[in-house]
Interface confidence: low
Amino acid sequence: TPEVWVQVQMEATELSSFTVHCGFLGPGSISLVTVSWGGPDGAGGTKLAVLHPELGTRQWAPARQARWETQSSISLALEDSGASSPFANTTFCCKFASFPEGSWESCGSLPPSSDPGLSAPPTPVPILRAD
């Protein structure tokens, strides 16, 4: 069964900068990735970025740069312009879609005990699965 993993990483040099890494484990060709925060996309979450393998990417503040790392994984750099970062206690969700087989979504967050520069371990939390 396909799975989605999510890692949230705080940058060691800039405590207001975070990077979300997401990947898809399974067969099939990824045709769309949606990253949201505050919950799953379409279920209370706010869209941060959309990545299309052929047509490029779109991102919305506070997302700074969304990019493909491999054919089945992406990264999203976030920058908080405020005095204190709201990202530490935030849930980030990644939805990977494979047309027309379906879509898979998992969420993750930065553990409270995480030191700057250390990434959180993979914490797949399946939200929605294709049947």
Partner: antibody
Framework: EVQLVESGGGLVKPGGSLKLSCAAS????????MSWVRQTPAKRLEWVAT????????YYPDTVKGRFTISRDNAKNTLYLQMRSLRSEDTAMYYC?????????????WGQGTSVTVSS | QIVLTQSPAIMSASPGEKVTMTCSAS?????LYWYQQKPGSSPRLLIY???NLASGVPVRFSGSGSGTSYSLTLSRMEAEDAATYYC?????????FGAGTKLELK
Amino acid sequence: EVQLVESGGGLVKPGGSLKLSCAASGFTFSSYAMSWVRQTPAKRLEWVATITSGDIRTYYPDTVKGRFTISRDNAKNTLYLQMRSLRSEDTAMYYCVGHDDFHFYAMDYWGQGTSVTVSS
Amino acid sequence: QIVLTQSPAIMSASPGEKVTMTCSASSSVSYLYWYQQKPGSSPRLLIYDTSNLASGVPVRFSGSGSGTSYSLTLSRMEAEDAATYYCQQWSSYPLTFGAGTKLELK
């Protein structure tokens, strides 16, 4: 302005063949996934076929798989649907549909449709 | 395949009245879309990704829901909104549509 103009519909006998065309304009055709959707006389909407923009993958529901073939000619901005072994249940209005870049699973652009009647 | 059941099949509303119609999925759905079709015209995309308004769609339309239960709401009925509304999913192969809700002007 986005325009999708279907043609090629008509009356055909059961077991016959028909090829539908869809001329696209007003958008970058080669970058869009395209589909055919039909509407039965009972007004039910049914997905018929989809072709992706880049690597030309095609998808069909079991009801038409092996009988229908979707294809595209990006140089001519034209979408096609080759229909073979037609059955009475294939009688419908056939719509050409364009899918928006980042929500191309949504059917953003629709043509006016071309009518196909399968009857002896 | 996922079956989408729309209710009611037919409904009527007076101008200014609030209208809500539902789309129930036989299994959990990730993406849901709503279309409007007026007599003699092609369907038109209203809502994508459950709650996002398509370009040019009046703000009186809104979509919501998750899992297997979704709804389309019209905050104030207008004469031009008389049409048939269809929901559609692609979360599971094959793509399927609901049978539609016909909204008439009272």
